[in-house]
Every structure is written in structure tokens, then in C-alpha cells.
């Protein structure tokens, strides 16, 4: 016996919709092997009507697929618009027809039911409202108006204009009869059910003269949808469930092997931790329409979604829903990167974000993943230069390297900054991606001391120590604002071998300012970069006074060695909707720095890379 | 979930036929996946048919052991659901139990975990 298992027999109606659903044992062959749909001929051969391969018969064209289900065992053969001609037998199968694994399958399309005249047709999903519209005459306008149920010869009613409603429609169902001059009453069902289908009969009045109108409801399961998304990437549900749900809870479940759907997130704020910084709800809109991104998506992803509405923000049976079948593509053109960058208290972070390399002009963002209720995600930077308030002098987006990638910066880290920060751009809205931040125990590696008050029109040296790991790269101060961190001329004093060999005498690089103007005052980085790579960087404020007062605090750097190297990278992945920047409810507006001023002059400033002995200190 | 009370089982000769009823409380049965499982003693409980309505389809299954003198049918109207029987053999003896599985997903309906409504069972004696 073949171990491929599906429907025995199908039947349906002209004009409906099968989706035909076919098991098979999930070997590593078989997952990989082609699919197919075939129909029985009189000769025993079996013709191929679709396959996994791509191949659909002229006959299925424009109606028909087959979806392979890899990781359940299954695929699926939908088949649109039927007609009579499709009665017949058939076999889903793997590998060849003529001697594969199937399954036999017999399908049966039958007329449907006679319709009688005049038959408004109903088509609805399940879960969702219908208007059924019942026309009636002057003179019945004062009589009783019902909606009846045809259910073999019989009648039932539904419900009347005299208050009944029959118990199976009990808080579902309302009749609603216009002002005068108006000739028409309506019945609205909500929620529907697959067993409200079926031929319905309004009536005005009785007697001879009574006016009638028939109505077939036919109410459907929600086909998913199909959505294919890059691993790394991230995808939007979007999910509009229409006016008569706006004000209730609303869901994203996932379908699980026992066929129940597990929360993914909720409106009453239920989350499932496996989503933890990688997921928003997006508030909805007036008409209750809402959407859920997720990013970073992994292959454990891949599965049946559903979205609906329902008071206790779970799935319940009558209610509207939505449905998606989601797949993770494994070849991804987002760029592998670590989802978790490490750093240590006081020291520093470099997050590289990729971006579709196509739209190098887009905004670049970076945002702070924030999971209370329903998920948001503030911006923190933006590549306009704007900078939220508590992050001046520590935050920078910087375009390099370019390509596909560009560099969030953020140093003097404290506990606090641990979390989930996402990139983001307002172009391909894919590329969204996630990276986690950690703070591990340790020294930063950069020493720079802990403040400087320079005298105006004197001249100031901040040194900056870096560890022997740092000598092959390069070494940088930068003058911050909110526009970015503006590198200063670099003079190299030291000769090049004593980085090399990288001399006790020689692991410092000092920032000279002279003459010190207003313009001066504010933050600088010391930093550390290879090529277009950024790595560690230290922040030290400069403040300036009138009067001659003390230097600078020196910062010991022992230990300097001694703190891990630091991870540069982030979590590829994938999208939020394009709106979702300019969504104030998805990135709350924040205040922002103003610009710093001017940058320091070049002329006065510069970097010297040279012995720490000059500088009246020493490294261990 | 729904009720289910089954009905319809009892001895007969093999070669003979027997019609098991499957009566569903709950507004909401024919969104519901029926099937049949049936246990002999001393053994694993085996699927034996199933019937899934999505609004505009039908799609009926049964197991290889049963193909060709086992049909299910279910009719919505009376939310009750009909596994007819015929050319019985001894080694269909077992008590026939009704599953439901719940919407608006349906899974491998030969799982007896994707039900979540069982009924107490039938007891069927095929005599040689």
C-alpha cells in the first residue's frame, strides 16, 4: 500500500473551489522530490495537470497550484472555478506518475442546486457580516417583515419584525426596517457560521399578496494566503477584519502540529516569548484593520497564521479571521550577522545594518525595541542627523561602508541599553532587521578621561590608551553632533614600526586643540576603525571656560587589556510596512538634539598618535 | 466543544452490514471535521474514516483496511454524522468511537490528537 494518504473523495459545485490536501511520510527524498496532480484517463495513463516543477496543464491555467508543505509531510492542490468537466479521478503523487507514490482521489462536481429565480447570491467568509437586502411593496410596508431558512421543504424563521429571533442567530442577527419611502429592509448576520449557509427566503406580509425575496448564502472557510519572506527577513500580516470587530481584541495566532492556534501576539498584551524583540502590533486604524511585523525570522517560523478578533484575544469559532501560509526562504539575500552584539559597561557597540543595496539613497533609522502592550519601536537616530535627546554624544549613524550596510555607533553603555534595537530604512521595507544588545562584565578597552574643562584661547591634549589588539588599526578622533561624528586631521607623530611592534610606550592617540575656541566645546570620540569597519569607540566631553583652570581628569587605564573583544555586527532581517516610519504611533515622536554648532576647525585641531610617556602617563 | 453520542452498533454476520450515528450537540457542527476511530481490545486506536465540510466542499476519507465497504456521511441539518458499513469481516470487531475536530484548521484527520470531542463508543461484534 502506498504510504501517500489524501481525501478518498471530493465533492463540490460548479463555480466553487477545492483545496485537496495530500500526506506524505517527510523522508529527506521525498521532502525534495517532485509533487504532482494527475487525472486518470480511459488508456490508465495519467496526465499531469500540475506539479512542484512549475508545470500547469492549459487546462488548469490561471486556476489551479500545487503547494509542497516540506516540513509538515504535505502539499496542497487548489483548483478554482470548477466546472462538470472536472468529475473524474485523479492521483497525487511524488516522483513519476507512471510509478511513484500516490493516492487516488476522486473528484465529483455536481450543477448545485437549482436556484429559483431572481436568487441574490451571498458570498461570504466565515467570521465576517452579510446584508441581506429584502425589497417589498407600498402596501406591505406596514405588515411583518421575516427573514425564513429553507432547510429541505421545510421553512424556519430566522427572525421577524415582531422581536424573534431564532436561537442558532441569538446576538448575530438584526432586521432593520428603513424610515418611509424607503422599500427595503435589511437583515445583517455577523459571525457568520458554516452552518448559516444555505438558501434563505425574506417575506413582507402575508397572503396572496405578500411580497418575496430568495437569497443564497454561501459561506466559506478563508483560503490563506501565500507569503514567501527571505530568512533574516521580516514580514507584515496585514490584517482587516472589518468595522464590526473595531473595538474588539484582535490576535495573531500561529497553527500548531495539533491543530490549535498558539497567541503569537494580542492586543490585550500577550506575547509569546519566542517573538521577544522581534515583533510589533501596530495599533489599529479606525476601521479596525491592524498589522503585525515580524523580524529576524528564522525557519521554525515557517507555518499557518491567523489573525481575528475576539474579546478574550484568542481564536474562537464564528469570529472573523484572516489567514497566511508563511515560508522562510533559506537562500536569503540578507546578509548573515550576529543577532546579539556584546559590549561592557562604559564601553561601546558598532551595529552594522544592512540595507537593500539598490536604495543607497534611502533614510537610514535605528530604534529601540520597546515590548510594553503591544510592541513599539521609538527612533533613537536617523541618518538626517536627528538624535533623541538622552542619546546626545553617545549615539551616531554613520553611511559606511556603504553597499548595503551602514554603522550605528552607540558608546558609554550602562545596563540600561541592553535590549532589542531594530534597523530600519524607508525603502525596501525587507531589510528590516534586529540585533540584541548585551552588557557583559568587563573593562572597556578605550581609556579617555572621564571629563576635560579646556581654557579658552589655551591649548588642550586629551589622550585616549588602546590596548595592543588595536595597534594594526586605525585610530581616529571625531568631533560629535547630531549629524554624525566629524573626524578631525590626523598627525601621526610616532614612527609606524612602534605600532607595529606595538611598544609599551606607544599605545596612545591624543586629540590637540589649540587655540581652544566657544566653538570646541561639546563631545569627541577616540575610536578605532579598520577600513570603512568601525570598532570600539570612548566619548569625552569638552567644556570651555573663561578662566584658566585645571586641565583634564585622568582616567587610569589600567586593565586595558583585559576587557573581551568586542562582537561588530547585527541580526540580518526583514519588514515593517513602508508607513510604519512616518506612523507616529509606531515610532512615537521624540525630542530631538539640536545641531552642536560648528565643527572644530581643522587648522586647530588635531590627532596625535605618539608615546603615552609624553603625555605624563603610562599603560600597563 | 461539541457532545457526541454514538449509536448503531451491535453483533452481526460477517458479510452483514450495520449504519453507526454519530449525534453532535452544538450550534457550530458543521464547521466541525467528523471522524471515526475504532480500538479492538488490546490494541491502538485506529482511524477509520473522516468527512471535512468547508462551505462549499466535501472531502471524505477512510483507511486502506476499510476502502470500498465503508462510507462517511454526515448530514448538517440533523448534526449528526453516519459511518454505513457493509461486507463486515471479524477483524472490524472494536468499539467505533466519533471525533470532532474543532475549526477553523483541520489537520491530518488521521491523528486522533487533531480531535478534541470524543464520544464513548460504540461497541461492533462481527461473528464469522
Known amino acids: 500500500k502506498s504510504p501517500v494518504f489524501g481525501p478518498q473523495e471530493v465533492s463540490s459545485v460548479e463555480g466553487n473551489s477545492v483545496s485537496i490536501k495530500c500526506y506524505y511520510p517527510p523522508t529527506s527524498v521525498n521532502r525534495h522530490t517532485r509533487k504532482y496532480w494527475c487525472r486518470k484517463g480511459a488508456s490508465g495513463r495519467c496526465i499531469t495537470l500540475v506539479s512542484s516543477e512549475g508545470y500547469v496543464s492549459s487546462n488548469y491555467a490561471g486556476r489551479a497550484n500545487l503547494t509542497n508543505f516540506p516540513e509538515n509531510g504535505t502539499f496542497v492542490v487548489n483548483i478554482a472555478q470548477l466546472s462538470r468537466d472536472d468529475s473524474g479521478h485523479y492521483k497525487c503523487g511524488l516522483g513519476i506518475n507512471s510509478r511513484g507514490l500516490s493516492f487516488d482521489v476522486s473528484l465529483e462536481v455536481s450543477q448545485g442546486p437549482e436556484l429559483p429565480n431572481g436568487t441574490e447570491v451571498y458570498t461570504v467568509d466565515v467570521g465576517r457580516t452579510v446584508t441581506i437586502k429584502c425589497p417589498f411593496k407600498t402596501e406591505n410596508a406596514p405588515k411583518t417583515k421575516a427573514l425564513y431558512k429553507k432547510i429541505g421543504q421545510t421553512s424556519v424563521l430566522v427572525i421577524d419584525s415582531r422581536n424573534y429571533v431564532n436561537p442558532n442567530y441569538k446576538d448575530r442577527i438584526r432586521l432593520r426596517i428603513p424610515g418611509t419611502g424607503q422599500l427595503i429592509f435589511t437583515v445583517v448576520i455577523d459571525r457568520l457560521r458554516l452552518s448559516d449557509h444555505g438558501l434563505y427566503l425574506c417575506q413582507a406580509g402575508d397572503g396572496s399578496n405578500r411580497d418575496e425575496k430568495n437569497a443564497d448564502l454561501q459561506v466559506l472557510e478563508p483560503e490563506p494566503e501565500l507569503v514567501y519572506e527571505d530568512l533574516r527577513g521580516s514580514v507584515t500580516f496585514h490584517c482587516a477584519l472589518g468595522l464590526e470587530v473595531a473595538n474588539v481584541a484582535k490576535f495573531l495566532c500561529r497553527v500548531n502540529s495539533r491543530e490549535t492556534c498558539d497567541v503569537v501576539i494580542n492586543t490585550l498584551g500577550k506575547r509569546d516569548s519566542a517573538f521577544e524583540g522581534r515583533i510589533l502590533l501596530n495599533p489599529q486604524d479606525k476601521d479596525g484593520s491592524f498589522s503585525v511585523v515580524i523580524t529576524g525570522l528564522r525557519k521554525e517560523d515557517e507555518g499557518r497564521y491567523l489573525c481575528g478578533a475576539h474579546s478574550d484575544g484568542q481564536l474562537q469559532e464564528g469570529w472573523p479571521i484572516q489567514a497566511w501560509q508563511l515560508f522562510v526562504n533559506e537562500e536569503s539575500t540578507i546578509p548573515r550577522s550576529p543577532t546579539v552584539v556584546k559590549g561592557v559597561a562604559g564601553g561601546s557597540v558598532a551595529v552594522l545594518c544592512p540595507y537593500n543595496p539598490k536604495e543607497s539613497q534611502s533614510l537610514k533609522y535605528w530604534c529601540l525595541w520597546e515590548g510594553a502592550q503591544n510592541g513599539r519601536c521609538p527612533l533613537l537616530v536617523e541618518s538626517q542627523g536627528l538624535v533623541q535627546e538622552q542619546y546626545e554624544g553617545r549615539l551616531s549613524l554613520l553611511q559606511e561602508p556603504g553597499n548595503g550596510t551602514f554603522t550605528v555607533i552607540l558608546n558609554q553603555l550602562t545596563t540600561q541599553d541592553a535590549g532589542f534595537y531594530w534597523c530600519l530604512t524607508n525603502g525596501d521595507t525587507r531589510w528590516r532587521t534586529t540585533v540584541e544588545i548585551k552588557i557583559i562584565e568587563g573593562e572597556p578597552n578605550l581609556k579617555v578621561p572621564g571629563n576635560v574643562t579646556a581654557v579658552l584661547g589655551e591649548t588642550l591634549n586629551i589622550p585616549c590608551h588602546f590596548p595592543c589588539k588595536f595597534s594594526s588599526y586605525e585610530k581616529y578622533w571625531c568631533k560629535w553632533s547630531n549629524t554624525g561624528c566629524q573626524t578631525l586631521p590626523s598627525q601621526d607623530e610616532g614612527p609606524s614600526e612602534a605600532f607595529v611592534n606595538c611598544d609599551e610606550n606607544s599605545r596612545l592617540v591624543s586629540l590637540t586643540l589649540n587655540p581652544v575656541t566657544r566653538a570646541d566645546e561639546g563631545w569627541y570620540w577616540c575610536g578605532v576603525k579598520q577600513g570603512h569597519f568601525y570598532g570600539e569607540t570612548a566619548a569625552v566631553y569638552v567644556a570651555v571656560e573663561e578662566k584658566k583652570v585645571a586641565g583634564s581628569r585622568y582616567v587610569s587605564p589600567a586593565k586595558a587589556d583585559a576587557a573581551p573583544d568586542e562582537k561588530v555586527l547585527d541580526s540580518g532581517v526583514r519588514e515593517i510596512e513602508n508607513k510604519a516610519i512616518q506612523d507616529p504611533r509606531l515610532f512615537a515622536e521624540e525630542k530631538v538634539v539640536a545641531d552642536t554648532g560648528d565643527q572644530a576647525g581643522g587648522s586647530r585641531a588635531s590627532v596625535d598618535s605618539s608615546s603615552s610617556e609624553e603625555q605624563g602617563g603610562s599603560s600597563k | 466543544q461539541v457532545q457526541l453520542v454514538e449509536s448503531g452498533g451491535g453483533l452481526v454476520q460477517a458479510g452483514g452490514s450495520l449504519r453507526l450515528s454519530c449525534a453532535a450537540s452544538?450550534?457550530?457542527?458543521?464547521?466541525?471535521?467528523m471522524g471515526w476511530f475504532r480500538q479492538a481490545p488490546g490494541k491502538e486506536r485506529e482511524f477509520v474514516a473522516a468527512?471535512?465540510?468547508?462551505?462549499?466542499?466535501?472531502?471524505?476519507y477512510s483507511a486502506d483496511s476499510v476502502k470500498g465497504r465503508f462510507t462517511i456521511s454526515r448530514d448538517n441539518a440533523k448534526n449528526t454524522v453516519y459511518l454505513q458499513m457493509n461486507s463486515l469481516k471479524p477483524e472490524d470487531t472494536a468499539a467505533y468511537y466519533c471525533?470532532?475536530?474543532?475549526?477553523?484548521?483541520?489537520?491530518?484527520?488521521?491523528?486522533?490528537?487533531?480531535?478534541?470531542?470524543w464520544g464513548q463508543g460504540t461497541l461492533v461484534t462481527v461473528s464469522s
Open positions: 468527512i471535512h465540510w468547508n462551505g462549499a466542499s466535501t472531502y471524505r
Open positions: 471525533a470532532a475536530s474543532p475549526p477553523p484548521t483541520v489537520g491530518d484527520v488521521r491523528d486522533p490528537a487533531n480531535y478534541d470531542s
Open positions: 452544538g450550534r457550530t457542527f458543521s464547521s466541525y471535521a
